[in-house]
């Protein structure tokens, strides 16, 4: 759950308690079981860009 009083995440992103920040739903491609991915199921993700470390 997002901490009370914090701004909601922008469209195409979802709150991660594991990371304590909003995460881009496109990241669910890498790790579909990330905690924030549940919040992404309701809204379509932002356009995905392949990123390399």
């Amino acid at each position: 759950e997002q901490a009370p009083g914090t701004a909601p995440c922008s469209r195409g992103s979802s709150w991660s308690a594991d990371l304590d920040k909003c995460m881009d739903c496109a990241s669910c491609r890498a790790r579909p079981h990330s905690d924030f991915c549940l919040g992404c199921a309701a809204a379509p993700p932002a356009p995905f860009r392949l990123l390399w470390p």
Partner: antibody, heavy 120, light 112 residues
Framework: QVQLVQSGAEVKKPGASVKISCKVS????????IAWVKQAPGKGLEWIGE????????YYSEKFRGKATLTADKSTSTAYMELSSLRSEDTAVYYC?????????????WGQGTTVTVSS | DIVMTQSPLSLPVTPGEPASISCRSS???????????LYWYLQKPGQSPQLLIY???NLASGVPDRFSSSGSGTDFTLKISRVEAEDVGVYYC?????????FGGGTKVEIK
């Protein structure tokens, strides 16, 4: 470049504890998960658990819950795994591995491994 | 937990010849996104595991294109088109669909 450097080999007596470290460099420590994997002599790979270094949140394999404790020190970019109540079956090489949250592939960097030997 | 089963246990190979390793998962690794969360790792003698293939068919950075992988939701094959001496080691399949992260038992590839 990305590096995960683990602490040296340990020899412990049954019942003792051991704490091994994994110092990372070349990337932002809090941006990736650190997983720990066991490889017993002549055996395969077994996931122990993983930690989000930024928040300290952990996930464990049921098998290792109560055996392993994962922690992280953001100030030194170091992850730790403590193994308690050591038995002979804990003799193994233990690896830390960086697991991605952001990219399309996963587990792309591993430490060199730490050998733990439990012997009386 | 998802069980990953590999075969064969051991694979003697001739340099220059093709080789293939099979992996089966106890649950489909095909996600609703269309991505199949199957990974292949190689552990060379005395080394840490290294990623070869991610999401069933994508070569990791620096991996030669003689390696390829294909499959369905539960049955997968890693192919080496022409085995080289440097390809020896233990190959592991793994999934990244959910926790726990599980690996196959490994296939040891050795030169005949």
């Amino acid at each position: 470049q990305v590096q995960l450097v683990q602490s040296g080999a340990e020899v412990k007596k049954p019942g003792a504890s051991v704490k091994i470290s994994c110092k990372v460099s070349g990337y932002t420590f809090t941006d990736f998960i650190i997983a720990w994997v066991k490889q017993a002599p002549g055996k395969g790979l077994e996931w122990i658990g993983e930690i989000y270094p930024g928040t300290g949140r952990t996930y464990y394999s049921e098998k290792f819950r109560g055996k392993a404790t994962l922690t992280a020190d953001k100030s030194t970019s170091t992850a730790y795994m403590e193994l308690s109540s050591l038995r002979s079956e804990d003799t193994a090489v233990y690896y830390c591995a960086r697991r991605t949250i952001y990219y399309d592939y996963d587990g792309d960097y591993w430490g060199q491994g730490t050998t733990v030997t439990v012997s009386s | 937990d998802i069980v990953m089963t590999q075969s064969p246990l051991s694979l003697p190979v001739t340099p220059g010849e093709p080789a293939s390793i099979s992996c089966r998962s106890s649950k489909s690794l095909l996600h609703s996104s269309g991505i199949t969360y199957l990974y292949w790792y190689l552990q060379k003698p005395g080394q840490s595991p290294q990623l070869l293939i991610y999401q069933m068919s994508n070569l990791a950075s620096g991996v030669p294109d003689r390696f390829s992988s294909s499959g369905s939701g539960t049955d997968f094959t890693l192919k080496i088109s022409r085995v080289e001496a440097e390809d020896v080691g233990v190959y592991y399949c793994a999934h990244n669909l959910e926790l726990p992260w599980t690996f196959g038992g490994g296939t040891k590839v050795e030169i005949k």
